[in-house]
């Protein structure tokens, strides 16, 4: 039998990009950290 029309079974979860800056002293500037939230 042919399949009936359905969307993809995979749900889309938006990834969260969280930026943070940490002060590590005037001579080293700032470290920029990046956290990427995975698919829930």
């Amino acid at each position: 039998d042919a399949e009936f029309r359905h969307d993809s079974g995979y749900e889309v979860h938006h990834q969260k990009l969280v930026f943070f800056a940490e002060d590590v002293g005037s001579n080293k500037g700032a470290i920029i950290g990046l956290m990427v939230g995975g698919v829930v």
């Epitope: 039998d1 042919a2 399949e3 009936f4 029309r5 359905h6 969307d7 993809s8 079974g9 995979y10």
Partner: antibody, heavy 120, light 112 residues
């Protein structure tokens, strides 16, 4: 709110063509993901799926009836149509239209049904 | 076609009883997208069918939690934990994975 209502001739003679209309409100068949199907039920018997049409005019038919069925839509008038050619007494039934969408992928909304009697 | 076989065809109950309806499909109704499109509808006399359960086990909005669906592949079950008077009617399972979409013959839930 979403409503659907079927209309038809009520009575036909064998060999005539049945024309059914499903008039709906609360959604548009020009909206991506929308679809409407037809289901029938002979009195005191079970349900039989007939045909289905999507917003992009993609159509599906029950193969056992496909040669006799034509589903179509008028998006601007919020209507879906079903034609069944060469009706016989076996086509005597209540005919329902119902909506499903790609995100609400089930028949959540049904019309009240319209009754057809085929008799000579 | 996918044949949907419901048992029993008639189910006499007393109010407050648990009721269980079985639905078996003649082949797997797992869609290629990974979902199983098995639905349950209740039809009362003179009314249109009403959706209870979709995708095997998901209760539709407003459906009491005494209704639950389960199963996989070809074997599915609808359970009503405590039957109330408003639950009486004919229950249909329905698959929308394969064309033609097909209903079971129905199970009549009635009072003993």
């Amino acid at each position: 709110q979403v409503t659907l209502k079927e209309s038809g001739p009520g009575i036909l003679k064998p060999s005539q063509t049945l024309s059914l209309t499903c008039s709906f409100s609360g959604f548009s068949l020009s909206t991506s993901g929308m679809s409407v199907g037809w289901i029938r039920q002979p009195s005191g018997k079970g349900l039989e799926w007939l045909a289905h049409i999507w917003w992009d005019d993609d159509k599906y038919y029950n193969p056992s009836l496909k040669s006799r069925l034509t589903i179509s839509k008028d998006t601007s008038r919020n209507q879906v149509f079903l034609k069944i050619t060469s009706v016989d007494t076996a086509d005597t039934a209540t005919y329902y239209c119902a909506r499903r969408t790609t995100t609400a992928d089930y028949f959540a909304y049904w019309g009240q049904g319209t009754t057809l009697t085929v008799s000579s | 076609d996918v044949l949907m076989t419901q048992t029993p065809l008639s189910l006499p109950v007393s109010l407050g009883d648990q009721a269980s309806i079985s639905c078996r499909s003649s082949q797997s109704i797992v869609h290629s997208n990974g979902n199983t499109y098995l639905e349950w509808y209740l039809q009362k006399p003179g009314q249109s069918p009403k959706l209870l359960i979709y995708k095997v086990s998901n209760r539709f909005s407003g459906v009491p939690d005494r209704f639950s669906g389960s199963g996989s592949g070809t074997d599915f079950t609808l359970k009503i934990s405590r039957v109330e008077a408003e639950d009486l009617g004919i229950y249909y399972c329905f698959q929308s994975s394969h064309v033609p979409l097909t209903f079971g013959a129905g199970t009549k839930l009635e009072l003993k």
